[in-house]
Amino acid sequence: FKVATPYSLYVCPEGQNVTLTCRLLGPVDKGHDVTFYKTWYRSSRGEVQTCSERRPIRNLTFQDLHLHHGGHQAANTSHDLAQRHGLESASDHHGNFSITMRNLTLLDSGLYCCLVVEIRHHHSEHRVHGAMELQVQTGKDAPSNCVVYPSSSQESENITA
């Protein structure tokens, strides 16, 4: 399986909400002995490998933000901890999973990584990740809504989170 990032860059005004998205692409084994662990963390663009370093998102670690389920089941973080920090991660039945960040500040700018781990006994631990950048802007040059830049081309889209 692979992870796709529909958008590689999100440019948002301060105070806005944004939803960062990743998509799990098949083939996805839906056997009873296979489960998927999905989570989010901040990182930096390493010289060797992007997303190798794991930093918290608003003081929440990737352990606090994970989703766990088999195949393409829906799931979301329900505990109050994430919501108290203005965060919520979720996934749907189609392999999409996301993290929503509310009331953005300049400190939220940086590189964000989604991680998927396939858990299967007696097999290698299969890990894949996706990376995207969030730029939070303030002042007269800031957009009125979030602008997202697709990973495949340089065309941009305006979105209202």
């Epitope: 990737f62 352990q63 505990h79 991680l115 858990i119």
Partner: antibody
Framework: QVQLVESGGGLVKPGGSLRLSCAAS????????MSWIRQAPGKGLEWVSW????????YYADSVKGRFTISRDNAKNSLYLQMNSLRAEDTAVYYC???????????WGRGTLVTVSS | EIVLTQSPATLSLSPGERATLSCRAS??????LAWYQQKPGQAPRLLIY???NRATGIPARFSGSGSGTDFTLTISSLEPEDFAVYYC?????????FGQGTKVEIK
Amino acid sequence: QVQLVESGGGLVKPGGSLRLSCAASGEPFSDYYMSWIRQAPGKGLEWVSWISNSGEPIYYADSVKGRFTISRDNAKNSLYLQMNSLRAEDTAVYYCARDEPGWEFDLWGRGTLVTVSS
Amino acid sequence: EIVLTQSPATLSLSPGERATLSCRASQSVSSYLAWYQQKPGQAPRLLIYDASNRATGIPARFSGSGSGTDFTLTISSLEPEDFAVYYCQQRNNWPRTFGQGTKVEIK
């Protein structure tokens, strides 16, 4: 930040049983995947068993499969290891540790000593 | 299962010296290798994850390198509190396995 404290160790005769507990303080234990790891006196570390946050799936080392059972009670913030048919070679300090997929054992308890001897 | 072999078994050095510890895997573990430090009577502490990344709060004098089957933990300048036993551990395959440990002792 979660803190882990093991209990339930002690002296038991070969063939006997023991139940270890790992109590977690702090939040959110119910989100964490956990393992038991043991260390025989003066020896190295050996992974014993793993359990997901929801209780399934569960994995065991071949050396304990069929004799040990891992379980958890998220409402009580507790992890357990039921050890049956104990052998002398099971003598060790048993640690519980957080073991998230794609990650490492990043949070450990202080351990509880199990001695199997006649 | 994957066997991890650490060398040397014991390393006798003085404070301020450089320590180089080796871990070799019986088959490739990609970069899914960690290093732990353990002091007498204490639980192990995570130092390095994914072969080369320092865990939170670990001093910069600790560094890890390698991929595949050969890995190295380097302590650039030993501090008194660094004398301990160091274990490597792989999570590429079940079961999780550890090396037998390298003891870093004061010369």
